[in-house]
Amino acid sequence: FVRTKIDTTENLLNTEVHSSPAQRWSMQVPPEVSAEAGDAAVLPCTFTHPHRHYDGPLTAIWRAGEPYAGPQVFRCAAARGSELCQTALSLHGRFRLLGNPRRNDLSLRVERLALADDRRYFCRVEFAGDVHDRYESRHGVRLHVTAAPRIVNISVLPSPAHAFRALCTAEGEPPPALAWSGPALGNSLAAVRSPREGHGHLVTAELPALTHDGRYTCTAANSLGRSEASVYLFRFHGASGAST
């Protein structure tokens, strides 16, 4: 299920119109598209241009992160007069052109979404040959990837004075709430660290001091679901064994 956020203040879409008496380029992209991890999403992009009946060579490009300089994730090229835009680049084979650039449509389908795909994407078209022009969406479309929680790491670590602490890291969007439960704990939201820089979907919770042997369970929950994982603490002869 894919949701396209409509921004009524921008005439339903982010429409970038750049015109003068001799030229008129515009690109229409929605501000945001939402989809769940594992699903597919469509990034809509249509354009108008000042070159009437252009049928020369063209290249369609999508890039991620920032306009003009972000890494390309998709590129295809159409020869003069051809309606077929032959894919030259599709990152991890997950990007596919849905639109027909000859009909001013650069819409892109992204398969098997992952949280790492949650970023801004920019469509671009280049005309080559007799007419020599190019244009790129500067605002782009934000792909918002949602995901049920997944615990990516749970561990017991030594800490000073022969004590032990437990760490639980989970990912999800919205970022999940983490809770620890275990011997003499009840439910604890112990020391949740906010998402790390550059890892916006990761949340870590720490239990700073494990005072009893037994099973400690970390639960991650958001609006899309919950996940849990456990570690076991057994202390003997001043050492510990922990398993998950």
Epitope: Q72, R75, A77
Partner: antibody
Framework: EVQLVESDGGLVQPGRSLKLSCAAS????????LAWVRQAPTKGLEWVAS????????YYRDSVKGRFTISRDNAKSTLSLQMDSLRSEDTATYYC???????????WGQGTLVTVSS | DIVMTQTPLSLSVTPGASASISCRSS???????????VFWYLQKPGRSPRLLIY???NLASGVPDRFRGSGSETDFTLKISRVEAEDVGIYYC?????????FGSGTKLEIK
Amino acid sequence: EVQLVESDGGLVQPGRSLKLSCAASGFTFSDYYLAWVRQAPTKGLEWVASVSYEGITNYYRDSVKGRFTISRDNAKSTLSLQMDSLRSEDTATYYCARQDWEGGFAYWGQGTLVTVSS
Amino acid sequence: DIVMTQTPLSLSVTPGASASISCRSSKSLLHSPGLTYVFWYLQKPGRSPRLLIYRVSNLASGVPDRFRGSGSETDFTLKISRVEAEDVGIYYCGQLLENPFTFGSGTKLEIK
């Protein structure tokens, strides 16, 4: 680190041919247009030719059209310039450059001198 | 062809002073709002050219903020504040709006 390294140029007689090549590293080669820019001794910069991502589209300045051929090998990350029917006015240092449309000629090779003389 | 006209041809500057180079194009280099295809390059003696400024006013990677580009449409300026000895060389403006891509004839900066 982005690097562009041109092959050696040399002395060539008028009417003869020479092929220049440029080895690129440090970036995703096929994501960029590439170009050759030349500079005659004690003169300014003069764009020669550009080639598109897959090498489908080439652009040339009028004075070299029909004589020079720009090409690329994305598998080997190399750019080439085949120069035929060379003239004395083609004498110059030839630079290969990465052409970032909105970012200019962002990176340049060290240049290689081509001298056309009898 | 778009002609890029640079002035002055040369200038001699005292270290610490500022320098200004002008570039005029024979046609507007404005493609669309916020997108003007003019660039500045520096070629130090015996070296390859190096990108200084892209799209009128954006500093290329590693370029000190003593360099500042400005202008619009057909008139562009490169200003160097607090000139240093390492700034000597030939400065070129260039355009990537239309084929053939063209450069100015260059401005030679010397230190007094």
